[in-house]
């Protein structure tokens, strides 16, 4: 959570001379209340931007707009103070707005924006703006919250993004996992365009349980040029433990812009379908479709071999 | 001295309800996503619930959601948990946290004790 | 969600000892560790957070590492007051999963 590094940071518009000034999110107000502080704002809208810096780095900033309510309190409003909060660190971000000139009605509903907030993929904000001067104790609130998630690396405009990109969100392995006889597992992926190792990691469950049956880590070599972009195929031996039979496969590259903490990919197997409370089947039924024209039932061995091939 | 003093448990049969109470003092509350946290007998620590300093983001444990209520005075400095349609596994010290700037919690209350019992 | 899994679950070792413990996510965490530890009767204490820096006030003979699925604390020399429960806890996204724990007691 920090600035978005090289904007000189403007909030002035026609009608207002405004300043931005860092905030060490306690604005004085709060220290010595005043009488008389305007009500909050109206409408706070969030939504995700890419902006690049000085370094030419694409990076997710929050874009929060928001705008005055049509009262008289606008006479006496001085400013805003925004807060981003991340909630899981408590890590906590504020920007001062500063009226530098006092606030008149017009005929359009003033409205302000804010876009210099860098958040991180897969991060929960609590934003808040806060009209200044801060009510007295026990005044009404004149603030407004709304919370916001930002996307993983997954979502596509996040995808590009220099903190995703360095945690290899570019790389589509295009997992196939096919279930052989005899207990194994076909992995397929493709592989990326740098010579770096990969691990895969199985982990296989009872069916609609969560607790693992069979866990296998298959190291596979950094590849080289030649084989890049191409893909990668291994057999994987399961434990022959009836019903552990959901597998879950993960792959992690260890790419060097992320080394151990590179975005993994997975697919998963699914148990085969059981019927609930499979109906036993008559001796005399044919499990076969007979050939046009012919009646014939085959013996029983016959019907045997074709009843445990209909089940496989 | 920044403290953490939990209030409201005690014994309750299953179904029953209690409502426990943290009370913050020697920080600012108001700028504190604040936990609950829960400890069964003899057993590990188990996140409750987690409410951010102005409520507007809540989330909750999978086992309490739908049961339990998280909310914030933070005119008073307090913390509440609303315990509904309580049950034999809900029984646990239950702490309130307060978490670090840069991850984890540094601030827990002593814990107050809910007893769930027929 | 993302599991959290401990090893060992308990263990045994003399003053003076090097001890390693081992905490997993089932998924990458990036760096939101953090590691407690319970004496018994008594409430947890933060040890370390962002899986590496030490909260203040913590004995310099514990350490943390790791980042993104597999993470290890380590106590270079235990001490008789180091006999407790160690904790380990994601943060990163809700829910913020605790491991199950790992018991250290003297030998």
């Known amino acids: 959570l920090r600035l978005l590094d090289h904007r000189a940071l403007v909030c002035s518009q026609p009608g207002l001379n405004c300043t931005v000034k860092n905030s060490t999110c306690l604005d004085d107000s709060w220290i010595h209340p005043r009488n008389l502080t305007p009500s909050s704002p109206k409408n706070i809208y969030i939504n995700l931007s890419v902006s690049s810096t000085q370094h030419g780095e694409l990076v997710p900033v929050l874009h929060v707009e928001w705008t005055l309510q049509t009262d008289a309190s606008i006479l006496y409003l001085e400013g805003a103070e925004l807060s981003v909060l991340q909630l899981n660190t408590n890590e906590r971000l504020c920007v001062r707005f500063e009226f530098l000139s006092k606030l008149r009605h017009h005929h359009r509903r003033w409205r302000f924006t804010f876009s210099h907030f860098v958040v991180d993929p897969d991060q929960e904000y609590e934003v808040t703006v806060h009209h200044l001067p801060k009510p007295i104790p026990d005044g009404d609130p004149n603030h407004q919250s709304k919370n916001f998630l930002v996307p993983d690396c997954e979502h596509a405009r996040m995808k590009v993004t220099t903190p995703c990109m360095s945690s290899g969100s570019l790389w589509d392995p295009n997992i196939t996992v096919e279930t052989l006889e005899a207990h194994q597992l076909r992995v397929s992926f493709t592989l990326w365009n740098e010579s770096t190792h990969y691990q895969i990691l199985l982990t296989s469950f009872p069916h609609m349980e969560n607790h693992s049956c069979f866990e296998h880590m298959h190291h596979i070599p950094a590849p080289r040029p030649e084989e890049f972009h191409q893909r990668s195929n291994v057999t994987l031996t399961l434990r022959n433990l009836k019903g552990c039979c959901r597998h879950q496969v993960q792959i992690q590259p260890f790419f060097s812009s992320c080394l151990n903490d590179c975005l993994r990919h997975s697919a998963t197997v699914s148990c085969p379908e059981m019927p609930d409370t499979p109906e036993p089947i008559p001796d005399y039924m044919p499990l076969w479709e007979p050939r046009s024209g012919s009646s014939d039932y085959k013996d029983d061995d016959d019907k045997g071999s074709s009843h445990h091939h209909h089940h496989h | 001295e920044v403290q953490l003093v939990e209030s409201g448990g005690g014994s309750v049969q299953p179904g029953g309800s209690l409502r426990l109470s943290c009370a913050a003092s020697?920080?600012?509350?108001?700028?504190?996503?604040m936990n609950w946290v829960r400890q069964a007998p003899g057993k590990g620590l188990e996140w409750v619930s987690i409410?951010?300093?102005?409520?507007?983001?809540?989330h909750y444990a999978d086992s309490v959601k739908g049961r339990f209520t998280i909310s914030r005075d933070n005119a008073k400095n307090s913390l509440y948990l609303q315990m509904n349609s309580l049950r034999d596994e809900d029984t646990a010290v239950y702490y309130c946290?307060?978490?670090?700037?840069?991850?984890?919690?540094?601030?827990w209350g002593q814990g107050t004790t809910v007893t769930v019992s027929s | 969600d993302i599991q959290m899994t401990q090893s060992p679950s308990s263990l045994s070792a003399s003053v003076g000892d090097r001890v390693t413990i081992t905490c997993r996510a089932s998924?990458?965490?990036?760096?939101?560790l953090a590691w407690y530890q319970q004496k018994p009767g008594k409430f947890p204490e933060l040890l370390i957070y962002?899986?590496?820096t030490l909260q203040s006030g913590v004995p310099s003979r514990f350490s943390g590492s790791g980042s993104g699925t597999d993470f290890t604390l380590t106590i270079s020399s235990l001490q008789p007051e180091d006999v407790a429960t160690y904790y380990c806890?994601?943060?990163?996204?809700?829910?913020?999963?605790f491991g199950p724990g790992t018991k250290v007691d003297i030998k």
């Open positions: 946290a307060r978490p670090k700037v840069g991850g984890g919690m540094d601030v």
């Open positions: 020697g920080f600012t509350f108001s700028s504190y996503s």
């Open positions: 409410i951010s300093s102005r409520s507007s983001i809540i």
């Open positions: 998924q990458g965490i990036s760096n939101y």
């Open positions: 962002a899986a590496s």
């Open positions: 806890q994601k943060y990163n996204r809700a829910p913020f999963t």
